[in-house]
């Protein structure tokens, strides 16, 4: 099948890093500078991504693969392939229309990115607040008041769960 296809379409023989040049009798020509083809049989090469401004180059463009960008310090990636850079804030803050602002009372953010989330409502689970929440930390829920008898040992606060939202895709 491959041989049949290559007889029908000479471009299918062109490997990654080249393109099938219609202006030169469909011979395989290397991709020009600042362009690439990641698969064989392509009739054009794609322009390399340029990492400018708040973007910085994580991986240089080659003839067979696009450049990869990340963000300069003080910013973090958003979107597939780091399509956007978003400003970092401090813990206890979130990025708003007017820049980094403290979390409103009753909400917290324990990271330099993301949004302020409401404190856990311990009473919904029939528990009491063991440690009050802050702008940077969620409340820690303990046993229900009825469970706390004199001399009962205090509950060790659980380690906070990792905030979702930082895995690819």
């Amino acid at each position: 099948f491959e041989r049949t296809r290559s007889l029908q379409d000479p471009c299918s023989n062109c490997p990654a890093g080249t393109f099938c040049d219609n202006n030169r009798n469909q011979i395989c020509s290397p991709c020009p500078p600042n362009s690439f083809s990641s698969a064989g049989g392509q009739r054009t090469c794609d322009i390399c991504r340029q990492c400018k401004g708040v973007f910085r180059t994580r991986k240089e463009c080659s003839s067979t693969s696009n450049a990869e960008c990340d963000c300069t310090p003080g910013f973090h990636c958003l979107g597939a392939g780091c399509s956007m850079c978003e400003q970092d804030c401090k813990q206890g803050q979130e990025l708003t229309k007017k820049g980094c602002k403290d979390c409103c009372f009753g909400t917290f953010n324990d990271q330099k990115r993301g949004i302020c989330r409401p404190w856990t409502n311990c009473s919904l689970d029939g528990k009491s607040v063991l440690v009050n929440g802050t702008k940077e930390r969620d409340v820690v829920c303990g046993p229900s008041p009825a469970d706390l008898s004199p001399g009962a040992s205090s509950v060790t606060p659980p380690a906070p769960a990792r905030e979702p939202g930082h895995s690819p895709q």
């Epitope: 990025l95 708003t96 602002k101 409103c104 009753g106 949004i115 856990t120 979702p164």
Partner: antibody
């Protein structure tokens, strides 16, 4: 590709409970908050709450507190929304939607929706 | 809880520009995201993070913001843009609210 597939339509009697499932695929399930939104016939969208699939933590809209429970099973990448003490005005299409990551929260993608009909 | 107000209905001539607005106190702090919903279908995200479009959303859709009002603009409206449009934002307590919805008719 990222996809959310919900369970099928349900018919319930007033006072009963309903549990709707939302199976996620194409991404790391524990990496993104999941929200639930409902839409009554001919009406607008109404936010119900979210679950953090990593920790199981939840936040419910005040209107639904005491009646809604959001849970998840990370082993099968599925989120659940259970609504109890159903009334006729709970008849609606219920959607799950994944929260995007960023300073501006957004919902993408959405499940196809589950019609819950409450009728005696 | 905070509210987001939209015009119930807006119409636009084919190929013309239309602006759909969303007004609310929370929009002084947060940007809205925008959703398109066609009859019998789930909502689809069209604008997020100020003025970003998900892949597959045409560049005739754009977002803007001023004071307590965010706007969705469709430049050169097409017949397939006829739908309901909803804005969404968080409030200061960390909850979410949808706008009342705008029915767009393309004439």
């Amino acid at each position: 590709q990222v996809q959310l597939v919900q369970s099928g339509a349900e018919v319930k009697k007033p006072g009963a409970s309903v549990k709707v499932s939302c199976k996620a695929s194409g991404y790391t399930f524990t990496g993104y908050y999941m929200h639930w939104v409902r839409q009554a016939p001919g009406q607008g969208l109404e936010w119900m709450g979210w679950i953090n699939p990593n920790s199981g933590g939840t936040n419910y809209a005040q209107k639904f507190q005491g009646r809604v429970t959001m849970t998840r099973d990370t082993s099968i990448s599925t989120a659940y929304m259970e609504l109890s003490r159903l009334r006729s005005d709970d008849t609606a299409v219920y959607y799950c939607a994944r929260e995007g990551v960023g300073a501006t929260s957004w919902f993408d993608p959405w499940g196809q929706g589950t019609l819950v009909t409450v009728s005696s | 809880s905070s509210e987001l107000t939209q015009d119930p209905a807006v119409s636009v001539a084919l190929g013309q520009t239309v602006r759909i607005t969303c007004q609310g106190d929370s929009l002084r702090r947060y940007h809205a995201s925008w959703y398109q919903q066609k009859p019998g279908q789930a909502p689809v995200l069209v604008i997020y993070n100020k003025n970003n479009r998900p892949s597959g959303i045409p560049d005739r859709f754009s977002g803007s913001s001023s004071g307590n009002t965010d706007s969705l603009t469709i430049t050169g409206a097409q017949a397939e843009d006829e739908a309901d449009y909803y804005c969404n934002s968080r409030d200061s307590s960390g909850n979410y609210v949808f706008g009342t919805g705008t029915k767009l008719t393309v004439l």
